[in-house]
């Protein structure tokens, strides 16, 4: 019956395992009159045969490593051998079995590594090959370090990338390797196929000898540089040295200072280029970089620390032109009147900024001089001799000398004698009642006015009132501003109100003076007031936990894979339904309940990454309010694009007849990501039959040369098939065709009689 093993002539692909003796036919093609027989051409290798009646079979075991794909053509012929149907392409894909063991390219490798090299940076590659298919486990190699000699404290200093064979230092190796202690190491490396995951995997081993060399690329000790240097600049302050000559040095100012006063020469000597000012900047941290001749960094940058040493170049300064203090009439001896805090820009906690205070003059000297004293180092003023009388002298002026070890400055203090603070503030109301506000009331709104009065001397610290909320507002949502002229208090909203966390707040205010109360007088219930704040609910939209959610997946993830998730909460506690907006490529779906995002179609990095969609969170019930956030899906590249020609190569021609073998250059590309080193394509002719006439040779990772092998070509178009392999994991291969015309030329251009043919080639070789 027609079906799996028989049917009409049409393009077909068959997969056959290598190494198996033939056990059944491949296919039975059925002829349609006038076809009576079939013809098989292409890469038969004398293995594939078609019988007259269309029976396609193979006569011996296949070997994928000899040929992984047999490109055959089958044509139906009439009795005269004339093609009446086809030829159609028949592709035999030879499936791999694990019949080849991996082999290291060398039985011994030698390499060297500098101490303190960056962990994970390869300094040596071991390389094994396995003729089996790298797209299957049979050819997937897994490298391992079997042993490290010597092994100190059971710590591995070396690691190997089990896929690439790249050997690098571990973090411990970077820190501890020291040629003075141990200048050489030996590693035994194994490679297994089957990705190292099977008991039946084949393996090979190799030996690696590693020499540890000294690393002189080290950060110098921190430098101290005295400020305001008068020596001629630039002044060498330190140096760095790369391990080999010829490095190009530069400094990097990470702080992006408007003035960067350092430079480096090509010996690695570092200079300060102008005097420094500690008070402008007391320390600099910058980086020294060594690059190769192409401007590529040779290693990590070194951190250079410069500390600017202080000199005493700043006098003390007064806090203000006149500092005003108040003292009550009956204050006792020794009471603190206030503290004069002068400043010195020189370095804190050094002799250069250590200040002394001394009273040099008191006016008036009534009833006597020396009524006040100042603590020499703290600057605190105290009442020294007796209580003061406002009616005798309501104001005193002091001149105070503030000095560091080299400079002196005079500061001025005014002391006002005020009435005693024997009256407490009294609220006009003890209860301001209830106030109902919506939770979305604006910040800064005044919601209540409160008033207390104080019978002490007006416009002094004894009568000034400060209002504090002492209860009912632990979140600090409210504040009280005082009008200094009227002592009126204005209650304002400082932070958003929230029905969900505080629907009712019982607020208690306290009114107090900045001046202390006289001995025996205490604040009582009159200085307290209360009010009740009731907050009403406003339906608010759900809130996402992030403005932007980001996830990263490989572009080849299986359909249905979870690629990320988003979360939102509704302030009112309603359930949330999630949806997607702007999924223009139809790649994603979101679980309405959990916010988990899944792929529903094949992803493609080459179509654009990151892929940006919006996620919408909507209240279930209520007002159905919704919020929007962003979901960014970063797609990591896999090798899923076969190489192709970088441009259109129609119109290539050689002038016929060829006087000597000629050649032309073509370029390949593919759409996958090529970090760092770019593509590394390999090129070969697309079929064995082309090898008599053409050869292809690699120029670099992207370009190759197609050359003629002789000069005896017919005057016609030849289509040259070229196989381009990208060497990726898995490797992908593209077969491209270069049409090359051999034609009569006039003045170096292809000549065709008028009306003879269209599409005249335009590029001569």
């Amino acid at each position: 019956q027609e079906g799996k093993f028989s049917g009409p002539l049409k393009p077909m692909t068959f997969s056959i395992y290598e190494g198996q003796e033939p056990s059944q036919i491949i296919f039975q093609f059925k002829a349609n009159p006038p076809a009576v027989t079939f013809e098989l051409t292409g890469e038969t290798d004398n293995i594939f045969v078609i019988e007259r009646e269309g029976l396609l079979y193979y006569n011996r075991a296949l070997d994928r490593e000899t040929r992984s794909t047999h490109n055959l053509q089958v044509a139906a012929l009439d009795a005269n051998g004339i093609i009446v149907e086809g030829p159609v392409p028949i592709t035999i894909k030879v499936k791999d079995i694990n019949d080849n063991r991996p082999t290291f390219l060398q039985s011994k490798y030698e390499g060297s590594v500098r101490q303190n090299s960056r962990p994970g940076k390869p300094f040596l590659y071991v390389n094994a090959t396995d003729l089996d298919d790298p797209a299957t486990p049979n050819g997937q190699l897994y490298y391992q370090i079997v042993i490290q000699l010597p092994m100190i404290n059971n710590v591995m200093y070396f690691q190997i990338n089990n896929k690439t064979g790249a050997i690098s230092l571990t973090r411990e190796g970077s820190q501890e390797l020291n040629p003075a202690k141990n200048p050489s190491y030996n590693l035994v490396i194994s490679v297994k196929d089957m990705g190292g995951q099977s008991e039946n995997s084949f393996s090979d081993t190799t030996s690696v000898d590693i020499i540890v060399t000294e690393n002189i690329w080290k950060a110098p000790k921190p430098v101290e540089m005295v400020e305001n240097s008068t020596d001629p600049h630039p002044i060498k302050i330190t140096q760095v040295r790369w391990n080999d000559p010829g490095a190009q040095y530069s400094l990097v100012d990470k702080e992006k200072l408007p003035r960067f006063p350092f430079s480096i020469d090509q010996e690695g000597d570092i200079y300060v280029t102008q005097p420094l000012d500690r008070e402008e900047k007391d320390a600099y941290v910058f980086y020294a970089v060594a690059k190769d001749e192409y401007g590529k960094p040779l290693s990590y940058p070194l951190e250079i620390h410069v500390k600017v040493k202080d000199i005493n170049d700043n006098p003390p300064t007064c806090p203000s032109p006149v500092t005003v203090f108040e003292v009550q009439e009956n204050e006792r001896l020794g009471n603190s009147i206030g503290t004069l805090t002068a400043h010195d820009r020189d370095e804190e906690n050094t002799a250069n900024s250590f200040l002394n205070y001394r009273i040099v003059e008191q006016t008036p000297k009534l009833p006597m001089d020396g009524l006040f004293l100042i603590q020499t180092y703290a600057g605190m003023l105290q009442l020294a001799k007796q209580s003061l009388k406002k009616q005798d002298t309501p104001q005193y002026n002091l001149t105070i000398e503030v000095s560091d070890k080299d400079f002196k400055t005079l500061c001025f203090v005014q002391i006002n004698v005020i009435d005693i603070n024997d009256q407490i503030p009294i609220f006009e109301k003890s209860d301001y009642g209830n106030l109902t506000l919506a939770e979305d009331t604006n910040i800064g709104s005044t919601i209540l006015t409160i008033q207390a009065t104080d019978a002490d001397e007006p416009f002094t610290g004894s009568s000034k009132i400060l209002y504090h909320i002492i209860k009912g507002d632990s979140e600090g949502r409210l504040g009280v501003d005082t009008d200094p002229h009227t002592n009126t208090g204005y209650v304002i909203i400082k932070k958003p109100l929230d029905f969900e966390t505080a629907a009712v707040s019982n607020i208690v205010f306290k009114a107090e003076n900045p001046e202390p109360l006289v001995f025996g007088v205490k604040y009582n219930a009159s200085s307290f007031a209360k009010f009740t704040l009731i907050v009403t609910d406003v339906n608010e939209a759900p809130q996402f936990s992030q403005h932007v959610f980001q996830a990263k997946v490989s572009e080849d993830v299986a359909i249905g894979t979870k690629v990320g998730n988003v979360t939102a909460k509704d302030p009112e506690g309603l359930d949330i339904s999630y949806s997607l907006r702007g999924d223009t490529r139809g790649w994603l779906k979101i679980d309405h309940v959990t916010g988990e995002i899944f792929s529903v179609a094949p992803l493609d990095r080459e179509a654009g990454s990151p892929y940006r969609v919006q996620v919408v969170a909507t209240e279930v019930g209520g007002s159905s309010l919704s919020s929007v956030s962003e979901f960014h899906l970063i797609l990591m590249d896999v090798n899923d694009n076969p190489p192709r020609l970088a441009k259109d190569y129609t119109g290539l021609f050689f002038c016929h007849p060829l006087s000597a073998p000629g050649s032309l250059i073509f370029e390949a590309t593919d759409d996958d990501q090529h970090l760092f080193r770019g593509p590394h394509f390999t090129f070969s002719l697309g079929s064995g039959s082309l090898q008599n006439d053409w050869e292809v040779s690699k120029i670099n990772g992207t370009h190759a040369r197609l050359s003629t092998r002789h000069t005896e070509f017919e005057e016609r178009e030849y289509v040259v098939l070229i196989r381009i392999n990208d060497g990726g994991r898995p490797p992908l291969e593209g077969i491209v065709s270069l049409p090359v015309t051999f034609c009569s030329c006039v003045e170096g251009s292809c000549f065709r009689p008028a009306g003879h043919q269209t599409g005249i080639p335009t590029v001569g070789m």
């Epitope: 009159p33 006038p34 009576v36 027989t37 051409t41 007259r52 053509q73 044509a75 009439d78 009795a79 005269n80 051998g81 004339i82 093609i83 086809g86 030829p87 016609r716």
Partner: antibody, heavy 123, light 113 residues
Framework: EVQLQQSVAELVKPGASVKMSCKVS????????IHWMKQRPEQGLEWIGY????????GYNEKFKGKATLTADTSSSTAYMQLNSLTSEDSAVYFC????????????????WGQGTTLTVSS | DIVMSQSPSSLAVSVGEKVTMSCKSS????????????LAWYQQKPGQSPKVLIY???TRESGVPDRFTGSGSGTDFTLTITSVKSEDLAVYYC?????????FGGGTRLEIK
Amino acid sequence: EVQLQQSVAELVKPGASVKMSCKVSGYTLTDHTIHWMKQRPEQGLEWIGYIYPRDGITGYNEKFKGKATLTADTSSSTAYMQLNSLTSEDSAVYFCARWGYSYRNYAYYYDYWGQGTTLTVSS
Amino acid sequence: DIVMSQSPSSLAVSVGEKVTMSCKSSQSLLHSSNQKNYLAWYQQKPGQSPKVLIYWASTRESGVPDRFTGSGSGTDFTLTITSVKSEDLAVYYCQQYYSYPWTFGGGTRLEIK
């Protein structure tokens, strides 16, 4: 040695029919197609058609359909061409020839010819 | 039908001379699948049946002297006899087997001076 032996001459009246033969030897008749050609004096060759004796498949030049009928007898290793409703225009030398192609033998040309049968149509 | 045109219809040359004769087809005889030209050359000596010289436009049949060469592609073909001998006196036919009905050219008669 491969040979194709044709009847030497035929003399027939206008309106009559003639069946000329081509006997092969030295190979199996069913392996190759037999083709027939017409050649008038001082003129070129015209292809009449072919027969594949293995399964009796025939192919004709549209010009000779209804005029010529090709058959084969594998038991006697002989191919035949019958011409009917003869006129003077049919007077010519008729050649049979073996087409060289066969399964696994890719000779795309007439490799063996008969010596020709001279047909004269005259009243 | 594909029309085959041969020229010249006759020519006379001396022994030892080089001869070229042309055959043109009304459409291309080059098959895209195998890049072969479906054309043969035959020689018919007086009183004899035709005999193949060249097939696939340029492949010489075994036993045919190498002074006979076929060339050309597509629609233009040439038979060249590099050094004519007296036994080459004959009519030369080209024939296409690209599509049915197969057709022959009118022939080129080669005479010896």
